[in-house]
Amino acid sequence: EEELQVIQPDKSVSVAAGESAILHCTVTSLIPVGPIQWFRGAGPARELIYNQKEGHFPRVTTVSESTKRENMDFSISISNITPADAGTYYCVKFRKGSPDTEFKSGAGTELSVRAKPSAPVVSGPAARATPQHTVSFTCESHGFSPRDITLKWFKNGNELSDFQTNVDPVGESVSYSIHSTAKVVLTREDVHSQVICEVAHVTLQGDPLRGTANLSETIRVPPTLEVTQQPVRAENQVNVTCQVRKFYPQRLQLTWLENGNVSRTETASTVTENKDGTYNWMSWLLVNVSAHRDDVKLTCQVEHDGQPAVSKSHDLKVSAHPKEQGSNTAAENTGSNERNIY
């Protein structure tokens, strides 16, 4: 009679994580008597996957009635496959004895596990940066298999080219991680911009995963200041305004200085938003020129988002306005941003 052969017909099997893997094995003879066992790997460190007669293998079931005496099909199904299950599986026939001895092994079936990458997480710099500066964004995704993966960067739909990507580990592993760093040059119009990291993998069936970062969390657009003197509102009164334009984020504090002395400090509240996401704000002072003998230097000083203050000054010519003799009464405040200077 021909010697028993152990046949594993599938050289390889690929299974998606979470599914069951069926590993086929048949023997060509009932002789010699002895059990079949399944192992992952070969050699002394091989891992027992299934023993017909003893042990605990809750994820393994036999495909046919493998315990029937005449049975020659020893295929198994392994449930809830994870990347850690990848490897080469051997169906091994033992000859009964004291102890049982290995008689013949199948050629092995390589199980590869397709595991989806995790949702990409995009993170930007810890501190805000201003337009014209280059900032780095990182994108990470984990737990995928096989190793082949494609990562792309976009800014507002436009593909970026300045990035570096690593897939770890370099050698064989049950699953892999990808890490990419992209460099982005900020512009003043980037408040509404988005940076997108897109990951494509065989497990995603052409529907890539995306991670996004809003540049609003990264950019700081410093304000431009303009101080102007409005036409005389009433006799001896001048309205001076400070236009704070195109700033982001909103956190802003404005201080009026009169000849270098602090006159009033206020925080930007009722701002107007521009189409590009930046903000404008205006503060004004009502100056009673009759209270001044000399010219007045008015300074609008702005501290934006914790940065060093920027300022703009305006010289108010007192001589240009006739003085009202003996008058040092305050003009009436007519707005929350108004201030009289004596």
Partner: antibody
Framework: EVQLVQSGAEVKKPGATVKISCKVS????????MHWVQQAPGKGLEWIGR????????KYAPKFQGRVTITADTSTNTAYMELSSLRSEDTAVYYC??????WGQGTLVTVSS | EIVLTQSPATLSLSPGERATLSCSAS???????LYWYQQKPGQAPKLWIY???NLASGIPARFSGSGSGTDYTLTISSLEPEDFAVYYC?????????FGQGTKLEIK
């Protein structure tokens, strides 16, 4: 549901023989090795031996070899463990287990003169 | 025969503490064949961890197993009152199969 139900407690005299049964349900006894384990009072677990009910092949621990006989009746889905030449140190709870995973409730055997 | 030596014989700890139980084999045991059982007074042993590191059904995730070759460990990250019991390691790599002498985990 897998269940292993053992026979009741036994009191034996030194030199006698005891035979404990383990009736299983929820699986076919032929499909698994059936093991027997001893636990003396306040002591640990000690493997006695096992049987392959499919062909009655047995393996025994050297300590029990010659005094123990493990058998199985596949028609009634029952395994048996017989221990002869009993001595006081054989006083113990005896457990059957299926393939190391499922255990019977235990049978107390007291050997006393 | 492979002799399994468990240490310590008794471990006195309080709920919430971390427990580390060791099992040392006199010769190498394949990790696939190293099991742990829990036993409480008057009860049959229960399979707790199989193949060194796999938790049996219903076993809480605070339990973990590790090791290879001759040294194996059962760890309980944060003890709960119901964890106090005797734990046995067991090898079925070669005949005769053997158990460790057990580690009694008791409340301090």
């Amino acid at each position: 549901e897998v269940q292993l139900v053992q026979s009741g407690a036994e009191v034996k005299k030194p030199g006698a023989t005891v035979k404990i049964s383990c009736k299983v349900s929820g699986f076919n006894i032929k499909d698994y090795y059936m093991h027997w384990v001893q636990q003396a009072p306040g002591k640990g677990l000690e493997w006695i031996g096992r049987i392959d009910p499919e062909d009655a092949e047995t393996k025994y621990a050297p300590k029990f070899q010659g005094r123990v006989t493990i058998t199985a009746d596949t028609s009634t889905n029952t395994a048996y463990m017989e221990l002869s030449s009993l001595r006081s140190e054989d006083t113990a709870v005896y457990y059957c287990d299926r393939g190391l995973a499922y255990w019977g409730q235990g049978t107390l055997v007291t050997v006393s003169s | 025969e492979i002799v399994l030596t468990q240490s310590p014989a008794t471990l006195s700890l309080s709920p919430g503490e971390r427990a580390t139980l060791s099992c040392s084999a006199s010769s190498s045991v394949s990790s696939s064949y190293l099991y742990w059982y829990q036993q409480k007074p008057g009860q049959a042993p229960k399979l707790w961890i199989y193949s060194t590191s796999n938790l049996a059904s219903g076993i809480p995730a605070r339990f973990s197993g590790s090791g290879s070759g001759t040294d194996y460990t059962l760890t309980i990250s944060s003890l709960e009152p119901e964890d106090f019991a005797v734990y046995y390691c067991h090898q079925w790599s070669s005949y005769p199969y053997t158990f460790g002498q057990g580690t009694k985990l008791e409340i301090k």
